[in-house]
């Protein structure tokens, strides 16, 4: 059975595969293919090494470890849902039927859709200005600074309190999802 590995759409996927060279630099050919390991070779080869270097690859498939020390783990750059499936790492040890074969299952999940709490930070950056509020007493100038610890509830409360002020207009103009009034 295959070992399962997961990645999100848009991330890099990592599929580990290792061997120990008999001597430093005494490398063994390796192939990576899409689909379970067949009896010989790799089907749908995406990357191949020889005794010296990577000698074949297709786009987005990388050996990113120290392959000279036997780290032939595959990195797939910027994955899509179509990258899901079984991958074969085949270490082609000389001799009849000596190959080491590893089937690895890659499961790609849709990217998490994060709601926009970053809006809050946008606010913070957007209002380091001075503003004058109209209140019951004399005009009062307040400095908002960069509002480092303010949260959306506080902003909403603040916006309600300052409904008539320029801040309220600024909040509205910023496109943020805060109901005022």
């Amino acid at each position: 059975s295959e070992v399962e590995y997961r990645a999100e759409v848009g991330q890099n996927a990592y599929l580990p595969c290792f061997y120990t060279p008999a001597a430093p630099g005494n490398l063994v050919p390796v192939c990576w293919g899409k689909g379970a390991c067949p009896v010989f070779e790799c089907g749908n080869v995406v990357l191949r090494t020889d005794e010296r270097d990577v000698n074949y690859w297709t786009s987005r498939y990388w050996l990113n470890g120290d392959f000279r020390k036997g780290d032939v783990s595959l990195t797939i750059e910027n994955v899509t849902l179509a990258d899901s499936g079984i991958y074969c790492c085949r270490i082609q040890i000389p001799g009849i039927m000596n190959d080491e074969k590893f089937n690895l299952k890659l499961v790609i999940k849709p990217a998490k859709v994060t709601p926009a709490p970053t809006r809050q930070r946008d606010f913070t950056a957007a209002f380091p200005r001075m503003l004058t509020t109209r209140g019951h007493g004399p005009a009062e100038t307040q400095t908002l600074g960069s509002l480092p610890d303010i949260n959306l509830t506080q902003i909403s409360t603040l916006a309600n309190e300052l409904r008539d002020s320029r801040l309220a207009n600024d909040l509205r103009d910023s496109g943020a999802t805060i109901r005022i009034g």
């Epitope: 890099n12 297709t58 987005r60 990388w62 990113n64």
Partner: nanobody, 129 residues
Framework: QVQLQESGGGLVQAGGSLRLSCAAS????????MGWFRQAPGKEREFVAS????????SYADSVKGRFTVSRDNAKNTVYLQMNSLKPEDTAVYYC??????????????????????WGQGTQVTVSS
């Protein structure tokens, strides 16, 4: 013609940070892997880090893993090397280099000087203890 200009080097205390920049011109920057190397006095030039065309794949020498971060901005034709937790043994001239291969889309990021065609003049980084 191809030009690579490093900047951002200097003298820093052990444990400190520096950010090196390499401004590139004279070629289609976004179509080449870029690398950083360094050379200490009396030593051979050694690989530090490299980054794929899109910036999605990076590779590091064991000696800098977890401390250095390579990045690139293709809109600004610039590659960066953020160096944190610097050690005296990081003292060297740091060079930016451009890959030999046009639009390397996969395989392996080159970590040998022979894999790079063009080099900057270098910027000195000195880490004092």
């Amino acid at each position: 013609q191809v030009q690579l200009q490093e900047s951002g080097g200097g003298l820093v205390q052990a444990g400190g940070s520096l950010r090196l920049s390499c401004a590139a011109s004279g070629f289609t920057f976004g179509s080449y892997v870029m690398g950083w190397f360094r050379q200490a006095p009396g030593k051979e030039r050694e690989f530090v880090a490299s980054i794929s065309t899109s910036g999605g794949i990076t590779s590091y020498a064991d000696s800098v893993k977890g401390r250095f971060t390579v990045s690139r901005d293709n809109a600004k034709n610039t590659v960066y090397l953020q160096m944190n937790s610097l050690k005296p043994e990081d003292t060297a001239v740091y060079y930016c280099a451009r890959d030999l291969t046009y639009y390397r889309t996969g395989g392996r990021l080159p970590d040998n000087a022979n894999g790079y065609a063009y080099w900057g003049q270098g910027t000195q980084v000195t880490v004092s203890s």
